[in-house]
């Protein structure tokens, strides 16, 4: 501790001539203390006569220093080495807005020489988020940005942020970005954005987590393009038709709204109607042929297929056998004595 | 299709005050950070303020800090520059852009601050 | 605030030269760099974000990469229309450009 009532140490010690000031090999650093562990400050001087610590302006009394001595080979000078401890207690005593802080002096023969001063400040995280960060709810490939501001701290937090109790690595995954003042931006939400976010402050004494921020990625919906118009509900004359569409152009996801608007449209259809063909009477019979045949036709045309209507079912023409009239037989009826006279039928005739 | 139009620029007084608008379309400004930014003639960008409605979020460059306001009207899809006690070096184009990223820039509004 | 300096401040090239442009920021800031082109009287547009990603619609032969705290735009093989003063952007801390670098014609 610090020599309140000691023996006072003297501003400079003898030692023989032309040895150069001091230089340190080894200055104090700056050093926290956590929790009730003391801090040790090092020190080491070539070359070195005496050496000691000051905290706050004053001498270290001796028996609070660990000197250790050594010999330079290749000058044979004096190095000297010294460590003290600095208690939480010590700290907490000092009274004022500075810092406390401690230096080392090294003695040769030549004068003093003075290290960096070192600061010793009692480390804490406190409990409680300055701001953390707010669940969210964004349409698919907006922005996102959360908060957070950790709680303070010596020394300051650092900040990570967690997705799904994973550390966010914004060199692995560029759609994250991380700032200065510990916010996280989402670039383009996706729906694998969709998760438990977390801040973590870490500092040398403690780890906080914020509460968990759940961020929802929704998808409204949108429609499908319009089916095709259905047929009319009246095969002829007036109806209806249909078409629909369906809100699957994305469906809605993630609590994402509906599609706005009719699934169904309906509109008035008129269609013509469908004439069937009818057939004209049978025209007259024709004279007898000299094929002793005689003929007669009709047409689809009593009316004539209309709009989609059926055409007539049966025949245009119609023939049968008649005798009035010259009728030559063939030649090899005439000469064939064995041959039979054939009866008559509907489409043969015998000359 | 995403467009952001500013306006509202024009030739002021030192000491006197200017509203900038930039109407935002293609997209819902409410879920995107928007930022203003600036450049003097013959000089390059400078970031001037930003915001994002959804996190009631703003932050300002230290060079207008005090003296710039940011806005947005998320049911005009607009947002805006109120830029008081204005300096001859506020003069510039300023720039509005989308996102963190600055993907969309509108083309541009000059403000000119001179006596 | 973050400084990012941006060299070289102008440089002349031909078309098909492979052109390379660097920032140094002042101090960390992770991989939050962006890359902007701007022609003389228009906006700027971007080119890269997060240090090495291309937006999408920009060609391939814009590239961009990290090294700690420097920062670098490659064009492979130089075309008319990229002929223009490039900016480099901060997003870690409150944004900060580059002061530029004119591309110019040969």
């Known amino acids: 501790g610090i020599d309140s009532g000691g023996q006072a140490l003297p501003d400079s010690f003898p030692s023989a001539p032309a040895e150069q000031l001091p230089h340190f090999l080894l200055e104090p650093e700056d050093a926290y203390i956590v929790k009730n562990k003391p801090v040790e400050l090092h020190c080491r001087a070539f070359p070195a006569t005496q050496i000691y610590f000051k905290c706050n302006g004053e001498w270290v009394s001796q028996k609070g220093h660990v000197t250790q001595e050594s010999l330079d080979e290749a000058t044979g000078l004096r190095i000297r080495e010294v460590q003290i401890e600095v208690s939480r207690q010590q700290v907490e005593e000092l009274f004022g807005l500075e810092d406390y802080w401690c230096q080392c002096v090294a003695w040769s023969s030549s004068g003093t020489t003075k290290s960096r001063r070192a600061y010793i400040r009692i480390a804490y995280l406190r409990k409680n988020f300055d701001q953390e960060p707010l669940a969210k709810e964004v349409p698919l490939d907006h922005e996102v940005l959360l908060q957070c501001r950790p709680p303070e701290g010596v020394p300051v937090a650092e900040v990570e942020w967690l997705k799904n109790e994973d550390v966010i690595d914004p060199a692995q995954d560029t759609n994250f970005l991380l700032t200065i003042d510990h916010n996280l931006i989402i670039r383009q939400a996706r729906l694998s954005d969709t998760a438990n976010y977390t801040c973590v402050a870490k500092n040398i004494v403690a780890k906080r987590r914020s509460t968990t921020a759940t961020v929802i990625v929704y998808v409204n919906g949108g429609w499908s393009s319009w089916a095709e118009w259905s047929p009319c509900s009246n095969r002829c004359g007036r109806g209806w038709q249909k078409r629909t569409r369906t809100c699957t152009n994305p469906a809605p996801l993630n609590g994402g709204a509906f599609c706005e608007g009719q699934a169904c449209q309906k509109t008035a259809c008129t269609t013509v109607c469908p004439v069937d063909g009818a057939w004209t009477e049978w025209s007259k019979w024709s004279a007898c042929s000299t094929e002793c045949a005689h003929w007669r036709s009709r047409e689809c045309m009593a009316p004539p297929p209309q709009n989609g209507g059926r055409d007539c079912s049966g025949t245009l023409l119609d023939s049968k056998n008649c005798t009035d009239g010259l009728c030559v037989l063939n030649q090899r009826t005439l000469n064939d004595p064995k041959s039979r006279p054939l009866e008559p039928s509907g489409d043969v005739a015998l000359y | 299709e995403v467009q952001l139009v500013e306006s509202g620029g024009g030739l002021v007084q030192p000491g006197g005050s200017l509203r900038l608008s930039c109407a935002a379309s293609?997209?819902?400004?409410?879920?995107?950070?928007m930022h203003w930014v600036r450049q003097a003639p013959g000089k390059g960008l400078e970031w001037v303020a930003s915001i994002y409605s959804y996190s009631s979020y703003t932050s300002y460059a230290d060079s207008v800090k005090g003296r710039f306001t940011i806005s947005a009207d998320t049911s005009k899809n607009t947002a805006y520059l109120q830029m008081n006690s204005l300096r001859a070096e506020d003069t510039a184009v300023y720039y509005c852009?989308?996102?963190?990223?600055?993907?969309?820039w509108g083309q541009g509004t000059l403000v000119t601050v001179s006596s | 605030d973050i400084q990012m300096t941006q060299s070289p401040s102008s440089l002349s090239a031909s078309v098909g030269d492979r052109v390379t442009i660097t920032c140094r920021a002042s101090?960390?800031?992770?991989?939050?760099v962006a890359w902007y082109q701007q022609k003389p009287g228009k906006a700027p547009k971007l080119l890269i974000y997060s240090a090495s990603s291309l937006y999408s619609g920009v060609p391939s032969r814009f590239s961009g990469s990290r090294s700690g705290t420097d920062f670098t735009l490659t064009i492979s093989s130089l075309q008319p229309e990229d002929f223009a003063t490039y900016y480099c952007?901060?997003?870690?801390?409150?944004?900060?450009f580059g002061q530029g670098t004119k591309v110019e014609i040969k």
């Open positions: 293609g997209f819902n400004l409410y879920y995107y950070s």
């Open positions: 952007q901060q997003s870690y801390g409150p944004f900060t």
């Open positions: 101090q960390s800031v992770s991989s939050a």
């Open positions: 852009a989308r996102s963190y990223a600055m993907d969309y």
